[in-house]
C-alpha cells in the first residue's frame, strides 16, 4: 500500500498555511492551517504544539489539555468557558490558544 503523491499517511498531519501578525506590541497572533488524515475515532487537533490527530472525544468534551497541546515542560490550563487553553513556560511566559 504505497502513498500517492500528496497523500498523507493515516494518523498524520501537515501544515499547509501559516500566518503571523506582530503588529501589536508584546503580542503575536499566529494562525495555522493544517491538513490531517485521521483514523476512525480521531479528529484534527494539537499535540506538542503541532497539528496532530487526537481522540475525537477530547474535542467533544472540550478538555483541550487532554490533547497534550503544550510542549513537554510547559503547563497546560483551560481557558474560562473552555474556549481554548494556555501553555505556560517554566520562565512564566504564557501562550494562549483559542479554538474557533
Amino acid at each position: 500500500q504505497f502513498l500517492k503523491e500528496g497523500q498523507l499517511a493515516a494518523g498524520t498531519c501537515e501544515v499547509i498555511a501559516a500566518h503571523r501578525d506582530s503588529s501589536q506590541p508584546r503580542r503575536t497572533i499566529a494562525r495555522q492551517t493544517a491538513r490531517c488524515a485521521c483514523r476512525k475515532g480521531q479528529i484534527a487537533g494539537t499535540t506538542r504544539a503541532r497539528p496532530a490527530c487526537v481522540d475525537a472525544r477530547i474535542i467533544k468534551t472540550k478538555q483541550w489539555c487532554d490533547m497534550l497541546p503544550c510542549l513537554e515542560g510547559e503547563g497546560c490550563d483551560l481557558l474560562i468557558n473552555r474556549s481554548g487553553w494556555t501553555c505556560t513556560q517554566p520562565g512564566g511566559r504564557i501562550k494562549t490558544t483559542t479554538v474557533s
Partner: antibody, heavy 113, light 107 residues
Framework: QSLEESGGRLVTPGTPLTLTCTAS????????MNWVRQAPGKGLEWIGI?????TTYYAGWAKGRFTISKTSTTVDLKITSPTSEDTATYFC??????????WGPGTLVTVSL | ELDLTQTPPSLSASVGGTVTINCLAS??????LAWYQQKPGKPPTLLIS???NLESGVPPRFSGSGSGTDYTLTIGGVQAEDAATYFC?????????FGAGTNVEIK
C-alpha cells in the same frame, strides 16, 4: 526520566489493593499514563489509560475490576476485588501517541489464600 | 476489538543470522504498530514505533516494515544480546493491544 511502581504484595482474594506509580524527571500532566500487566510466563495485557483531565479508558475485560486515578505526582491502580487470575507484575507506562516509551520496573502482586 | 496474531511463538537463531517476526492484525491499523524487546525480570523496551521508526539508541540491525494488517520485525546480523521476547503492539484505537510474543533464542 523514569517511572516506579509500588504497593505490590501478597493479598488474599477479595481484598482491595492499590498500586502507585511515581514519575521522576517529567510531569505526569504532560503524558497519558497507562497500566499494563503480565502474568508469570505470559504476555502483556493493557489494563487502561488516564488522561491529564482524569478521563479514563479501560480494556473491556478490566472494566469494573480496576480503577485508575491520579494526583499531580502519582497515578494509582486499584484492584477492586482481586482473584488468583490477577497474580501478575503490574507496570505503569507513559504514552503520547499510543506506544509506550517509558516503563516502570514493575511491581509484583500475588493473590493467594 | 483488535486482535494481533504474532508468529512464530518461538525461534532459534545463530549469531550473525537474520530473524523475522510477523504480526498480523485482525483489521487495518494504518501503520500504528510498535515493537518491544523484553528480557527476563525486566520491563519491555520500545524498539520501533509507527511500523518502521527506530527509537533512539536502538541498533540499526533492527528494522520494521508493513502496512494494513501485515507487519514484520527483522533483526539482521543477530547478536547474542538479542536473546529476548519480542512483542508487537497496535495503537490505532482503544483498547491498546499486544501480540502474544515471540521468544528468540540465540545458538
Amino acid at each position: 526520566q523514569s517511572l516506579e511502581e509500588s504497593g505490590g504484595r501478597l493479598v488474599t482474594p477479595g481484598t482491595p489493593l492499590t498500586l502507585t506509580c511515581t514519575a521522576s524527571g517529567f510531569s505526569l500532566s504532560s503524558y497519558y499514563m497507562n497500566w499494563v500487566r503480565q502474568a508469570p510466563g505470559k504476555g502483556l495485557e493493557w489494563i487502561g489509560i488516564i488522561y491529564p483531565s482524569g478521563t479514563t479508558y479501560y480494556a473491556g475485560w478490566a472494566k469494573g475490576r480496576f480503577t485508575i486515578s491520579k494526583t499531580s505526582t502519582t497515578v494509582d491502580l486499584k484492584i477492586t476485588s482481586p482473584t488468583s487470575e490477577d497474580t501478575a507484575t503490574y507496570f505503569c507506562a507513559r504514552t503520547v501517541s499510543g506506544y509506550f516509551d517509558i516503563w516502570g520496573p514493575g511491581t509484583l502482586v500475588t493473590v493467594s489464600l | 476489538e483488535l486482535d494481533l496474531t504474532q508468529t512464530p511463538p518461538s525461534l532459534s537463531a545463530s549469531v550473525g543470522g537474520t530473524v523475522t517476526i510477523n504480526c498480523l492484525a485482525s483489521e487495518d491499523i494504518y501503520s500504528a504498530l510498535a515493537w518491544y524487546q523484553q528480557k527476563p525480570g525486566k520491563p519491555p523496551t520500545l524498539l520501533i514505533s509507527g511500523t518502521s521508526n527506530l527509537e533512539s539508541g536502538v541498533p540499526p540491525r533492527f528494522s520494521g516494515s508493513g502496512s494494513g494488517t501485515d507487519y514484520t520485525l527483522t533483526i539482521g546480523g543477530v547478536q547474542a544480546e538479542d536473546a529476548a521476547t519480542y512483542f508487537c503492539q497496535g495503537y490505532s484505537s482503544y483498547p491498546l493491544t499486544f501480540g502474544a510474543g515471540t521468544n528468540v533464542e540465540i545458538k
